[in-house]
């Protein structure tokens, strides 16, 4: 059921900073608030199927907990709802967003720093969309566009000015400049970069008073990391002699990855060299016309018993290497099995 009109909906959004979020977002809600956590993709990237968890345990939807693919709502929050919430990719269990949620006794309030309830007919400034101004933290992937807005009214029409980290903020303070639209009560920054992080305050004032709202901008950079391989891939395979087999390896990497498929072999009866390094033969590596997608699959046709053994997907980039391995078991064809049975021996798979 949707929250009733008397309930505040407090939104907190985090953008996916890549496969391993570097930090938890600390957020606080008031008792009785509707908590809304959202987790959005970077650079126009769909996240795929997701699940939400609290303190490591999967959340199940109920009349009070509404679970969506990129959004979680908890109605009428109480102290028991405090904890660490995470949004994870359903298949890889990769953590996409992390929130540390506190629930305080008092319902959270808007950022009206003068704290006085001034009647609208006095002409003092007031927010025209206060219910939409509670998303105080904006976490945005680098290169995207951000617009802060403080829609207001008053009589006479108030002026608006902007501060960054408490100091006057002007276009020349930023490479690429800013767009100030006084009629829209807005500040626009295109192609944000990490140096745009900070607190942005709109100050709306006329001769009868002043109100202000502070937004926090976090610009998410993907920290460089070695390739990440999807859990569970490649998977162990059992195949019949003469059949075809495919191993799959899913690679995530910001820096361009180099992917190889290796087969573990024995040399003079040993699987490892004197230094402990395994003996391998390279089955597949990047060529002039191979795409990443093609390299993520190793196809074995018409397998023989010699094909049985351990296979490794090795992915490297400028930061480092990652690898996952899987085993192939090759079973004899059914006719051979029957012949062996008649001879009285037992086959253990």
């Amino acid at each position: 059921e949707p929250p009733g009109p008397e309930q505040r909906v407090v939104r907190r959004a985090a953008e996916v900073p890549g496969p391993e979020p570097s930090q938890q977002e600390q957020v606080a809600f008031g008792s009785g608030d509707t908590v809304e956590l959202s987790c959005h993709p970077p650079g126009g990237a769909p996240t795929g199927p997701t699940v939400w968890a609290k303190d490591g345990t999967g959340l199940v939807a109920s009349h009070r907990i509404l679970v969506g693919p990129q959004r979680l709502q908890v109605l009428n929050a109480s102290h028991e709802d405090a904890g660490v919430y995470s949004c994870q990719h359903r298949l890889t269990r990769r953590v996409l967003c992390h929130f540390s949620v506190r629930v305080t006794d008092a319902p959270s309030s808007g950022d009206d720093e003068d704290g006085e309830d001034v009647a609208e007919d006095t002409g003092a400034p007031y927010w025209t969309r206060p219910e939409r101004m509670d998303k105080k933290l904006l976490a945005v992937p680098a290169a995207n566009t951000v617009r802060f807005r403080c829609p207001a009214a008053g009589n006479p029409t108030p002026s608006i000015s902007w501060l960054k980290n408490g100091k006057e903020f002007r276009g020349e303070h930023r490479i690429g400049g800013i767009k100030l639209r006084h009629q829209q009560w807005s500040l626009v920054m295109e192609s944000v970069v990490p140096s745009d992080r900070g607190n942005y305050t709109c100050v709306v004032e006329n001769k009868f008073g002043s109100i202000r709202q502070t937004y926090t901008l976090d610009v998410l950079e993907r920290s460089p990391h070695r390739p990440i391989l999807q859990a569970g891939l490649p998977a162990n395979q059992t195949a019949i002699l003469g059949s075809d087999v495919e191993f799959h390896c899913k690679v995530y990497s910001d820096a361009q990855p180099h992917i190889q498929w290796l087969k573990h072999v024995e040399v003079n009866g040993s699987k490892v060299g004197p230094d402990g390094t395994p003996y391998v033969t390279v089955l597949k590596t990047a060529g002039a016309n191979t795409t990443d997608k093609e390299l993520e699959v190793l196809s074995l046709h018409n397998v023989t018993f010699e094909d049985a053994g351990e296979y490794t997907c090795l992915a490297g980039n400028s930061i480092g290497f990652s690898h996952h391995s899987a085993w192939l078991v090759v079973l004899p064809a059914e006719e051979e099995l029957m012949e062996t049975d008649e001879a009285g021996s037992v086959y253990a798979g």
């Epitope: 939104r11 650079g43 126009g44 990237a45 904006l138 290169a143 995207n144 829609p151």
Partner: antibody, heavy 126, light 109 residues
Framework: EVQLVQSGAEVKKPGASVKVSCKAS????????ISWVRQAPGQGLEWMGW????????NYAQKFQGRVTVTTDTSTSTAYMELRSLRSEDTAVYYC???????????????????WGQGTTVTVSS | QSVLTQPPSLSVAPGKTATFTCGGN??????VHWYRQKPGQAPVLVMY???ERPSGIPERMSGSNFGNTATLTITRVEAEDEADYYC???????????FGGGTKLTVLG
């Protein structure tokens, strides 16, 4: 200069497949998604689907589900759109476009397309 | 899924004002982007987040969005404004892009 350059015109028979490429330059490829939009002769723009250049995740319009595949190759900063089981109604200009995220403190997040390829004409005829 | 409605055509004399509308249920709760497409060319983004002009787009263009209608306005229309204009929203429920049917602007004379 930021640009998307698409592969050349194609003529295909009904039932065949077509694969259109879109090579990006002038920006960090993995920071923006790629959308595919088509336009039949004399008609409006029709969104087909999009792909994350970061992890390959995709999302397709219901109409094309199962018939279209959008992929990327980060080593060459190239996106691909393959459309299968072509019919005469698929005759159109196919565009790739860079997907940019817009984040608004009041309205939340929205995506738009700020840079477009020049278009690839695909003609399906027996 | 959002449905966006645009009138198919609009004719305006040079120097006058062209007003494009994009209708949709509670479209004012979403952010609208606008594209211009000249004959034989790819679309170009001319307005984003209802009211914001990308670099290189003249100040003659402005936008608004309220209730069930988003509007793109071009003042002092010139012959070079002749094109098709499309509105677009992002349907966050389905992660899908939705376009309006487009309006063809003809500059008279």
């Amino acid at each position: 200069e930021v640009q998307l350059v698409q592969s050349g015109a194609e003529v295909k028979k009904p039932g065949a497949s077509v694969k259109v490429s879109c090579k990006a330059s002038g920006y960090m490829f993995t920071s923006y998604g790629i959308s595919w939009v088509r336009q039949a002769p004399g008609q409006g723009l029709e969104w087909m689907g999009w792909v994350s250049t970061y992890n390959g995740d995709t999302n397709y319009a219901q109409k094309f589900q199962g018939r279209v595949t959008v992929t990327t190759d980060t080593s060459t900063s190239t996106a691909y759109m393959e459309l299968r089981s072509l019919r005469s109604e698929d005759t159109a200009v196919y565009y790739c476009a860079r997907v940019l995220g817009y984040y608004d403190s009041i309205d939340g997040y929205y995506y738009g397309m700020d840079v477009w390829g020049q278009g690839t004409t695909v003609t399906v005829s027996s | 899924q959002s449905v966006l409605t645009q009138p198919p055509s609009l004719s305006v004399a040079p120097g006058k004002t062209a007003t494009f509308t994009c209708g949709g249920n509670n479209i004012g709760d979403k952010s609208v982007h606008w594209y211009r497409q000249k004959p034989g060319q790819a679309p170009v983004l001319v307005m984003y987040l209802d009211t914001e002009r990308p670099s290189g787009i003249p100040e003659r263009m402005s936008g608004s969005n309220f209730g069930n209608t988003a509007t793109l306005t071009i003042t002092r229309v010139e012959a070079e404004d002749e094109a098709d204009y499309y509105c677009q929203v992002w349907d966050s429920g389905s992660d899908h892009v939705v376009f309006g049917g487009g309006t063809k602007l003809t500059v008279l004379g």
